[in-house]
């Protein structure tokens, strides 16, 4: 009894190909010997056809290869273009063909199937519509249109003019009688499954006068269009089902080892939770189609993917469906940057968003995604310089370091910033990313003025306290705009005393306005950075006023050197500016955001490349 | 979902026949495989006979046991597979089950984990 095993008998037709898997037991000794596939003759002795070790025999030649998978113990024949002499007994095995393990398989190829002249084909993927054409004499138009199934030797009615409806084919199929004159009638079946294909028969009449019309329905699963994407990039699928299905609810399931299929995202609000914060299903055009985009593809997202159109918003039989195999490249081009960044309330976080290299002049985004329904991600910031109003003063996007990553900066955090956001531009889609923002304990390590009020043609000199461990990087003061956050001068002004553990590390640097003017009016940023790599940044509005005549309340230049922890209005200001002090937002109240351009002096930091050491600003 | 119900079952005698079948409701495919198991008392579940379709070529593979005397027979219908069982011995007494799944000739139809689907299955007693 051989350990080798197969399929005893294959059954083929003309012109097709098979794919004949023989299992061996996985030895070392086994894995590595010889395999091959012969034809035994009349004489007994099997000729090899084609081996593992290279060989293909002339009649093979361009159409059958072996493949040894040593791994799961098994090899693969493939035969293609068969022909009736491709019949006959063969054997698979390993080592010597006339000893050793082998495997007895009969082949059997056959003209296939013999259809009736004048038979018309119908080709049609599962799900859609077929119109079947049936032609009659005129002395038949008034009599009853019928269409059967043929099944083995009996015909079976699947429906006619007089209104039988075939009960496997309720709801989904009708008769159509055209107008006197047209000797054709039609019938047309939708949401084609696969028990529907088959031999049909189309008749008009009765008696040896009747007219007859053979139908070759053949309906075929969509053949998967496999994909292939790098690990920690973007994937998109196309669905176009059909204006049929154009108001029907639509989805994306991808099929399990049971297979069955797992909604993925549908129109109905419905989401696979492993897809969180990186998939979005973009509403459908007049024609019905759509797509669905996954970001941050993991290696675990690898499948069969099908898209389809159901009430239900679920696979259902006979509906049409769309099929990808997603393969995921874990050799991949895009590099690897942190899925996670953390930061605390009132700190800020600095992510790192790649993008192809290749394309350096692409627009660059950042959007927030947002979960309802089908998933949306609004554009917060872009690299031409528009930002979302609510996050004016606090969100920057920065063509630094460049080479294939951008920065966003976004300071001011509050609990409600903790969520998915979107690395995008305008070219290569395959690189969008996935960012998930949250916020933990802790205390912002850049220490500056809740808000601060300038009176003008006065001198103002902002703090900004950092810690120890901030001592090697770059510190510096810039004044945000809706394009980014013009550079300023600033001084080292020597040990802080808002951190008293480490005092000689622990240093203020501050921003001097002299005079202050009008156009000094806005978010000013102090941040720390180390090359064209971004760290924590801290915010302050300044708010400009006339100077006030003796008596009027206002901040004093000098009260905006206090302490962080000291309170920089006195106790007597009124509840709007309480309001104001909890969320410095509220300072720029309902404006347009302006390109504030070049103010106050100062250059932009010039776009350079290097490589990213950390991500986000979080403190310890 | 995919509903099997094997049918054709009961007592025979030593070299005697029978012809099971099992048919599948539910979703239908054009690329399957289907198999018969069967379990004896006190025994573990072996494969008997398998067929995979792909497309127009059908692979029949069958246990060494079995082998001349069980055979898939060609004349299956659509959703219905059959196994003609001949020469009948004591030793084919167990319940016998049919398995099916969707997909191609690329698992090894022997391994019941490779199906997805499994009838109640139906006795099958042979004395001598």
């Known amino acids: 009894k051989s350990p080798v095993f197969g399929p005893q008998e294959v059954s083929s037709v003309e012109g097709n190909s098979v794919s004949i898997k023989c299992y061996y037991p996985p030895t070392s000794v086994n894995r590595h010997t010889r395999k091959y596939w012969c034809r035994k003759g009349a004489s007994g002795r099997c000729i090899t056809l084609v081996s593992s070790e290279g060989y293909v025999s002339s009649n093979y030649a361009g159409r059958a290869n072996l493949t040894n998978f040593p791994e799961n113990g098994t090899f693969v024949v493939n035969i293609a273009q068969l022909s009736r002499d491709d019949s006959g007994h063969y054997k698979c095995g390993l080592g010597i063909n006339s000893r050793g393990l082998s495997f007895d398989v009969s082949l059997e190829v056959s003209q296939g199937p013999e259809l009736p002249n004048g038979t018309e084909v119908y080709t049609v993927d599962v799900g859609r519509t077929v119109t079947i054409k049936c032609p009659f004499k005129t002395e038949n138009a008034p009599k009853t249109k019928a269409l059967y199934k043929k099944i083995g030797q009996t015909s079976v009615l699947v429906i006619d003019s007089r209104n039988y409806v075939n009960p496997n084919y309720k709801d989904r199929i009708r008769l159509r009688i055209p107008g006197t004159g047209q000797l054709i009638f039609t019938v047309v079946i939708d949401r084609l499954r696969l028990s529907d294909h088959g031999l049909y028969l189309c008749q008009a009449g009765d008696g040896s006068n009747r007219d007859e019309k053979n139908a070759d329905l053949q309906v075929l699963e969509p053949e998967p269009e496999l994909v292939y994407e790098d690990l920690r990039g973007s994937v998109t699928f196309h669905c176009a089902l059909g204006l049929e299905v154009a108001n029907v609810a639509k989805f994306l399931c991808r099929v399990n080892s049971r297979e069955t299929c797992d909604v993925v995202i549908n129109t109905l609000g419905k989401r696979d939770s492993a897809f969180e914060g990186r998939i979005l299903l973009n509403p459908q055009d007049k024609d019905g189609s759509f797509s669905v985009v996954i970001t941050g593809l993991r290696k675990e997202d690898e499948g069969r993917y099908l898209c389809g159109a159901h009430s239900d918003g679920q696979l259902q039989e006979g509906w049409p469906i769309q099929a990808w195999q997603l393969f995921v490249n874990e050799e991949s081009t895009i590099p690897r940057s942190p899925t996670v960044v953390k930061g605390v309330a009132g700190g800020s976080v600095a992510v790192l968003c790649p993008y192809n290299p290749k394309e350096s002049q692409s627009l660059k985004y950042w959007c927030l995604w947002e979960g309802a329904q089908n998933g949306r991600c609004p554009l917060l910031v872009e690299s031409q310089g528009l930002v979302q109003e609510q996050y004016e003063g606090r969100l920057s996007l920065l063509q630094e370091p460049g080479n294939g990553t951008f920065t966003v900066i976004l300071n001011q955090l509050t609990t409600q910033d903790a969520g998915f956001y979107w690395c995008l531009t305008n070219g290569d889609t395959r690189w969008r990313t996935t960012v998930e923002i949250k916020i933990i304990e802790g205390e912002p390590n850049l220490k500056v003025p809740g808000n601060v009020t300038a009176v003008l043609g006065e001198t103002l000199n902002i703090p900004c306290h950092f810690p120890c461990k901030f001592s090697s990087y770059e510190k510096y003061w810039c004044k945000w705009s809706n394009t980014g956050c013009q550079t300023l001068p600033s001084q080292d002004e020597g040990p802080s005393e808002a951190f008293v553990n480490c005092d000689e590390n622990s240093r203020l640097v501050s921003l001097t306005l002299n005079p202050v003017t009008r156009a000094d009016e806005g978010w000013y940023w102090c941040g720390v950075k180390q090359g064209h790599f971004y760290g924590e940044t801290a915010a302050v509005y300044v708010a400009v006023e006339e100077k006030k005549v003796a008596g009027s309340r206002y901040v004093s230049p000098a009260k905006a050197d206090a302490a962080p922890d000291e309170k920089v209005l006195d106790s007597g200001v009124r509840e709007i500016e309480n309001k104001a002090i909890q969320d410095p937002r509220l300072f720029a109240e309902e404006k347009v955001v302006a390109d504030t351009g070049d103010q106050a002096g100062g250059s932009r930091a010039s776009v350079d490349s290097s490589s990213s050491e950390e991500q986000g600003g979080s403190s310890k | 979902q995919v509903q099997l119900v094997e049918s054709g079952g009961g007592s025979v005698q030593t070299g005697g026949s029978l012809r099971l079948s099992c048919t599948a409701s539910?979703?239908?495919?054009?690329?399957?495989?289907m198999g018969w198991f069967r379990q004896a008392p006190g025994k573990e579940r072996e494969f008997v006979a398998g067929?995979?379709?792909?497309?127009?070529?059908?692979?029949?593979y069958y246990a060494d046991a079995v082998k001349g005397r069980f055979t898939i027979p060609r004349d299956n219908a659509d959703n219905t597979i059959y196994l003609q069982m001949d020469s009948m011995k004591p030793d084919d007494t167990a319940v016998y089950y049919c398995?099916?799944?969707?997909?191609?000739?690329?698992?090894?139809?022997?391994?019941?984990?490779?199906?997805?689907?499994w009838g109640p299955g139906t006795q099958v007693t042979v004395s001598s």
């Open positions: 067929i995979t379709r792909s497309g127009r070529t059908t692979y029949y």
């Open positions: 539910g979703r239908t495919f054009s690329n399957y495989g």
């Open positions: 398995a099916a799944r969707q997909g191609e000739n690329n698992y090894d139809p022997r391994s019941g984990s490779a199906y997805n689907y």
